[in-house]
Structure formats: C-alpha cells, structure tokens
C-alpha cells in the first residue's frame, strides 16, 4: 500500500514560521500577511517505526521537492540537514532511520524527536531568522514545541 501523507506547515511555540534559507537549510522567523507564502509546506509521511498513542513515526519531506529532513552525525554531533533523495523511491513506508522523527503530542503541542538520536529534537532558537537545528535539550531556551497547520493538497 502507498504511504499515507498529509501536507502541513509548522510553527514553533513563539509563532515563528519555517522558511528556506539557502538550498539545504530551514530557518525560523515571524511572518505576516503576504510573507506567509514563504513558509515551507511539508509532506508529512506516516512511516514504519515504534508507535504508541502519543508517539507516531513520520518523515518530513518538502512538498513537491525531493528534499527530506534527516539526522546525521557531523563532527561527532547529531545534526539536522535537508537531504536530497531520488523522487522515484520516496516517500516509502520503510524510510531509513535518519529520515524518521517520532511525532510526540503533548498538550496540543508537537515535538519531533529524532529516531536515529533519541532525546534530540527539531529545534528553533528564541532569536529571529536563525536556522532550524537538532537540539539535545527540552524545556531550555531552545524551542522544541510546534503546532501543525493542515494545508489542502
């Protein structure tokens, strides 16, 4: 069966939107009005992995682009990147672990934990216009809580 996907945008708990920053990076900033069109639309695919009531494994692709968020070691540090894939083979139900995030719902907020690196989360900073990254703490000054807005296909 084909993998189930939905289109959505994400905003952090400070209401910062996610936009492209160069060809292989995302950044977070406050957008208003027409600028909202800049925000990236994700194709969130529901993939194979450990699942529970509040934890669902997903892959986060960029809609109509052959780019997926992935988690890899760079200089011995878990790092978030946008990785180019062959569109003929993706998305798929059994995604490589680096592409998988555990979508965790807590109090109507979402966290995205790396399946490859447990306790590392998609994060933004308090500062404006700075990259989205993989952070190793929750509840500190880095932001790990997001809301999801559905986008019609």
């Amino acid at each position: 069966a084909p993998v189930r996907s939905l289109n959505c945008t994400l905003r952090d708990s400070q209401q910062k939107s996610l936009v492209m920053s160069g060809p292989y990076e995302l950044k977070a900033l406050h957008l208003q009005g027409q600028d909202m069109e800049q925000q990236v639309v994700f194709s969130m695919s529901f993939v194979q992995g450990e699942e529970s009531n509040d934890k669902i494994p997903v892959a986060l692709g960029l809609k109509e682009k052959n780019l997926y968020l992935s988690c890899v070691l760079k200089d011995d540090k878990p790092t978030l990147q946008l990785e180019s894939v062959d569109p003929k083979n993706y998305p798929k139900k059994k995604m490589e672990k680096r592409f998988v995030f555990n979508k965790i719902e807590i109090n109507n907020k979402l966290e995205f934990e790396s399946a490859q690196f447990p306790n590392w989360y998609i994060s933004t900073s308090q500062a404006e216009n700075m990259p989205v990254f993989l952070g190793g703490t929750k509840g500190g000054q880095d932001i790990t809580d997001f809301t999801m807005q559905f986008v019609s296909s």
Epitope: S21, G22, E25, K27, L29, K77, S123, S125, Q126, A127, E128, N129, M130, P131, F133, L134, G135, G136, T137, G140, Q141, D142
Partner: antibody, heavy 118, light 107 residues
C-alpha cells in the same frame, strides 16, 4: 556596558594550533548567538563561525570547515575558537561579536591578531 | 553562497557632501542586510540593520534603503568622523557574507 575581550592570538607555524577566547560582560551572554569574524591585513571582513546560545547550533565558513571549532562556556561567559591545521591564509585579526536582531553583529571586541608564518 | 557586491570601492568626498553607497546581493535577501563603519585600527561598528533600521546611538544622517537585491547606504552631510570604510553584510542565510567595502576618503 557591553564588552567583548578577545585573547589567545599570536604567532604560530603553519600546521599549528591556537585557541582564541572571548570574555563577555555587560549582558546576559547565555541568551545570545555569537560570531567570530576575521579580517586579513589590509583586506575586508570575513565571517568565520556562529554558535547558538545553547551551543547546539554551529555553522562555519567553507574556508575553515573541519579545521576550526567554535564553542562556549555560558557559566564563564566565554566564547572560544579552536583553530587547528593553521595556514598562512588564516593570518588575520579575529573579532568576536554579539549577534543582534536577525543576524547582524551589534557589538564587537577589539580583535586579536593571529599570524601564521614559518 | 550569496555574493555581496559594493560600489564604489572607494570615493573621495568633502565635509558636507551627501554620499550614497550601493550594495547588491547575488540573490534575493529580503531585508536581511546590515551596514557597518570601520575606522583604521578599530573594530567595525553597526550602523543599520534590517536594511533600514538605524542602530541605537547612530546619528540620523545615516540612512539605509532597499530590499531584495539592491540596497543603499546614504550619509547626509558628511562629517569629519565619517571618513572610514563601510561594509554591507547579508544575514539571509549562512554562510554570512560581506561586501568588499567602500573606502570614503577626504577630497
């Protein structure tokens, strides 16, 4: 008053290492992104590296990637730049700078000179 | 990487002149542009951020304009302390990049 004071520069042979420090005061260091920016003698400004307040997010210029490492100790209000495999073209004044709104450098240190020569 | 091109690279002017420096980005950087002033032997000083916002404490004779790829720094009525080198810097994406600088000399 915001103050940034770099130290650790000096003369080093090609292939050698240096560790620069930047002592910060007059603001809540742990809340700010920080940059290293360099300026070769008689040349323009070149951005080198950035680190987030928590230290989890770092980025580097291609010219130093794999050789330089930025880090910070928020308990000591200090920013660091570990420089390995130094080359003649790394000769420059190295400035640390506090990152202001949206990615500008709103306060700068006085700089420390690194000379790579045999 | 985004290339930043400044013009002119140097200019001679007199006290009281109105001076315009141009900075062009190789791609759209929205309004994520800063301007700095540097005098010999000193660290750069932030003048303008977000293309048009005057940094606190900077005299109002300095102003910035533009968005997208084309930006200008204007100095109305040059003062003796304004003879320096000016740099633009894009903050749209990493790696951050600076223009090559514009040296303003006394005529």
């Amino acid at each position: 008053e915001v103050q940034l004071l770099e130290s650790g520069g000096g003369l080093v042979q090609p292939g050698g290492s240096l560790r620069l420090s930047c002592a910060a005061s007059g603001f809540t260091f742990s809340k700010y992104f920080m940059f290293w920016v360099r300026q070769a003698p008689g040349k323009g400004l070149e951005w080198v590296s950035v680190i987030s307040p928590s230290g989890y997010m770092t980025r580097y210029a291609d010219s130093v990637k794999g050789r330089f490492t930025i880090s910070r100790d928020n308990s000591k209000n200090t920013l660091y730049l570990q420089m390995n495999s130094l080359r003649a073209e790394d000769t420059a004044v190295y400035y640390c700078a506090r990152v202001g709104y949206g990615g500008n450098s709103d306060y700068w240190g006085q700089g420390t000179l690194v000379t790579v020569s045999s | 990487d985004i290339q930043m091109t400044q013009s002119p690279s140097s200019v001679s002017a007199s006290v009281g002149d109105r001076l315009t420096i141009i900075c062009r980005a190789s791609q759209d950087i929205n309004r994520w542009l800063a301007w700095y002033q540097q005098t010999p032997g000193n660290a750069p000083k932030l003048l303008i951020h977000s293309a048009t916002s005057l940094q606190s404490g900077v005299p109002s004779r300095f102003s910035g304009s533009g968005s997208g790829t084309d930006f200008t720094l204007t100095i109305n009525s040059l003062q003796p302390e304004d003879f320096a080198t000016y740099y633009c810097q894009q903050a749209d994406s990493f790696p951050l990049t600076f223009g090559g600088g514009t040296k303003v000399e006394i005529k």
